[in-house]
Interface confidence: medium
């Protein structure tokens, strides 16, 4: 062929048109082409209908083609693998009717911000779905209902703050779930169902250890050998499970599976028996696990600990309160986001050196109906206000930015930033030990502060508080069993792992298949 390389391997006729500055499909490709590489071209838009004459096409690579739109028309009846990674797609095309035989779909590293409910309708043969490195914040319930044969699902490196409770329902063949490097703070009760999940990657999320995490804690305890930290180039047979990689974000990287849950409701008169799947509250001390029953106490004062204030908040408040236009690396104090607590148990974590800090206490008096009043945004002290500008780009950094928290694993793709603040070139520096600023009483909504970073809003607004700490350092101390700590970290959102670094996604696809 005058433009592309054609090679025959066994029964496959492979046509390589990679990196040829193509803006459209080259004419006169062999009609019996089975594998077509169109990577690294300048296609911008592409219509699958142009491939209809190639009735034997089983694999199509359209990665790195500047695609902003993929037109789905016609039918490619035997196409099994479609690689759309590293493009500029902002929405997932509805592929079901066009690609009924699709088994592998890779849409990693695009600009997907949401998925419609029927996004996967018609993809009943799909076995592998890779959505890593997009800008997904939520997923529709029932998203995966049309794909009962799904075996591998990568949602790593997105901005997911929550997961639909029934997302995995009916996925009896699912053997690998990659959720690392998101903004997940809890797992809904019953999320994992009862079927075995041999490979789960859950690290690099800001897990909020409160009473709502107990279902997840119990799942981690029961599935400790199936929880891994992904390491590039390591065969799964050589991988060591690492349940300690799943860490509380609000408690100095304490492993979630060891979270004591003191003060949480349990089976019995005082507890909400439906709160966490009838898992009894357990006090983990060393190797002994002691089931306990505790009367729920609602404190009138918030305990201030070295890692900040402990509160839980409603999921609903996340969508309504979170600024949508902030890039993960920005700092903004235009509004201090607060969240109403559901209820606040009086609990203390069992850690080797736990002391209550002298940071200012928040005096929050609960009211009889804690969900009715709105939180009052409060400007953060000692921070320069950033004015947003219309430019859809990342901010120019300030000359001396406040230390940014870092996540132990690499960064996810950011939320879309239609407007991003451009900081002033010389912000007023925050004092290293700021004066205690009393947090005003708010009727029902205490401000949630974390000493190292900010408000506990997953990957959203930031304010620097008393002691900037490198989360990386605490991670290295907390997980000595890692052969080597992850080496690439991103500001606020880590993301060392490229799309190839997901198991099964690229290089080690071979190695994690059921052995």
């Amino acid at each position: 062929h005058p433009i592309c390389e054609v090679s025959k391997v066994a029964s496959h006729l492979e046509v390589n048109c990679d990196k040829r500055n193509l803006t459209a499909l080259p004419p006169d490709l062999p009609k019996d082409t089975t594998i077509l590489h169109l990577s690294e071209n300048l296609l911008y838009t592409f219509s699958l209908a142009t491939l209809m004459p190639y009735t034997r096409l089983t694999q199509l690579n359209l990665d790195r083609c500047e695609l902003t739109k993929l037109q789905v028309d016609g039918t490619l009846p035997v196409l099994g693998t479609l690689d759309l990674s590293h493009n500029q797609l902002q929405s997932l095309p509805l592929l079901g009717q066009t690609l009924p035989a699709l088994t592998v779909l890779d849409v990693s590293f695009n600009r997907l911000t949401s998925l419609p409910l029927g996004a996967l309708r018609g993809l009943g043969e799909l076995q592998e779905l890779y959505l890593k490195g997009n800008e997904l914040k939520t997923l529709p319930p029932g998203l995966l209902t049309p794909t009962p044969k799904l075996e591998k699902l990568s949602l790593a490196n997105n901005n997911l703050t929550e997961l639909p409770a029934g997302l995995l329902n009916g996925l009896e063949n699912l053997d690998t779930l990659l959720l690392q490097e998101n903004s997940l703070y809890t797992i809904p009760k019953g999320f994992f169902g009862s079927h075995l999940l041999p490979f789960a990657f859950l690290h690099g999320n800001p897990w909020l250890c409160n009473c709502e995490i107990l279902y997840f804690r119990r799942w981690l305890q029961d599935n400790a050998e199936n929880v891994y930290v992904w390491k590039q180039g390591v065969d799964v047979k050589a991988m060591t499970s690492n349940v300690a990689s799943v860490q509380c974000d609000n408690s100095d990287k304490f492993p979630v599976y060891k979270y004591p849950g003191k003060g949480c409701p349990t089976l019995g008169d005082e507890g909400d028996t439906d709160l966490y799947d009838y898992y009894p509250e357990e006090d983990t001390e060393g190797d002994k696990v002691r089931a306990t029953r505790t009367v729920v106490k609602f404190p009138t004062k918030a305990h201030t600990t070295p890692w900040g204030l402990f509160y839980s908040w409603s999921t609903a408040s996340l969508d309504s309160q979170m600024p949508s236009s902030l890039h993960p690396t920005q700092e903004s104090t235009k509004e201090q986001t607060t969240f109403p607590p559901r209820w606040t148990p009086n609990f203390t974590l069992h850690m080797e050196s736990i002391t209550f800090s002298k940071t200012p206490k928040s005096t929050t008096e609960p009211t009889p109906s804690p969900t009715t009043s709105e939180p009052v945004p409060e400007p953060a002290p000692n921070m320069t206000t950033l004015e947003p500008t219309p430019s859809p780009t990342t901010p120019e950094p300030t000359s001396e930015p406040a230390p940014s928290p870092t996540t132990p694993e690499p960064t996810s793709e950011p939320a879309p930033s239609p407007t991003t603040p451009e900081p002033t070139s010389e912000p007023a520096p925050s004092p290293t030990t700021p004066e205690p600023t009393p947090i005003p009483t708010i009727a029902t909504s205490p401000t949630i502060l974390v000493s190292a970073t900010s408000l506990i809003t997953p990957k959203s607004t930031f304010l620097t508080t008393t002691k900037p700490v490198s989360l990386l350092e605490s991670t290295k101390k907390t997980i000595p069993e890692l052969d080597q700590p992850p080496k690439l970290r991103g500001v606020l959102q880590g993301h060392l792992e490229s799309s190839r670094n997901d198991p099964f996604l690229h290089p080690d696809f071979c190695c994690l298949l059921p052995l």
Epitope: H37, E40, N61, D63, R64, E66, D83, S85, H86, Q88, F109, R111, G133, E135, Q232, G233, H327, P328, T329, T393, T394, P410, T411, S412, E413, P414, S417, K487, L488, G490, V491, Q493, H495, L496, E497, S498, S499, R500, N501, L505, H506, P507, D508, F509, C510
Partner: antibody, heavy 118, light 113 residues
Framework: QVQLVESGGGVVQPGRSLRLSCAAS????????MSWVRQAPGKGLEWVAS???????YYPDSVLGRFTISRDNSKNTLYLQMNSLRAEDTAVYYC????????????WGQGTLVTVSS | DIVMTQSPLSLPVTPGEPASISCKSS????????????LAWYLQKPGQSPQLLIY???TRESGVPDRFSGSGSGTDFTLKISRVEAEDVGVYYC?????????FGQGTKVEIK
């Protein structure tokens, strides 16, 4: 034709800050991942930071928390904010382009020298 | 991190003669999904910035003379110059773009004898 022009280098004392810029032209800047790679005097190449077309930053441990990469697509400009500079940060800093975050660097700027010295 | 090791570190060459540089990675760079090895070669001529020669182990960048060729797979890679010319002098670097952080070899200095 693709052009990358770095600026902002100079002599700075340890602990101080500096901001580098890279002006890009000749291609659709917003569609490409961009990186900074440095070369200490008489030494080899070391990757410093990358930012995807969507704006996600990446760093190695050596600069994490001190350096910030950003981009302004409206100005076709890449930035590297360097804080808490150390003597070992002394190098020529190159701006480089790649198709996707995971890809090789297909175009490089001419570099700008940063000297950290008291 | 993936460690890239080049040899030799210095290579005196005679114009018109072939030259070969080796690059070894501490782990495989083969992407089994697309059968590509994520290795690139760059040349930094004296006083200039690096320029891309070869990517994905063996694909020449446009404008690069065909006397340059790359080969190898997994962890062992080779850059060959079939007939060295005076303009080929400089430092050659291999780089893996398979796993972050991206890492380079220490460089091989090619100079005319």
């Amino acid at each position: 034709q693709v052009q990358l022009v770095e600026s902002g280098g100079g002599v700075v004392q340890p602990g101080r800050s500096l901001r580098l810029s890279c002006a890009a032209s000749g291609f659709t800047f917003s569609s490409f991942a961009m990186s900074w790679v440095r070369q200490a005097p008489g030494k080899g190449l070391e990757w410093v930071a990358s930012i995807t077309s969507a704006g996600t930053p990446y760093y190695p441990d050596s600069v994490l928390g001190r350096f910030t990469i950003s981009r302004d697509n409206s100005k076709n400009t890449l930035y590297l904010q360097m804080n808490s500079l150390r003597a070992e940060d002394t190098a020529v800093y190159y701006c480089a382009r790649s198709r996707g975050y995971e890809d090789y660097f297909d175009y490089w700027g001419q570099g700008t020298l940063v000297t950290v010295s008291s | 991190d993936i460690v890239m090791t080049q040899s030799p570190l210095s290579l005196p060459v005679t114009p018109g003669e072939p030259a070969s540089i080796s690059c070894k990675s501490s782990q495989s760079l083969l992407n089994s999904r697309n059968q590509k090895n994520y290795l690139a070669w760059y040349l930094q001529k004296p006083g200039q910035s690096p320029q891309l020669l070869i990517y994905f182990t063996s694909t020449r960048e446009s404008g690069v003379p065909d006397r340059f060729s790359g080969s190898g797979s997994g962890t062992d890679f080779t850059l060959k110059i079939s007939r060295v010319e005076a303009e080929d002098v400089g430092v050659y670097y291999c780089q893996q773009h398979y796993s972050s952080p991206w890492t380079f070899g220490q460089g091989t200095k090619v100079e005319i004898k």
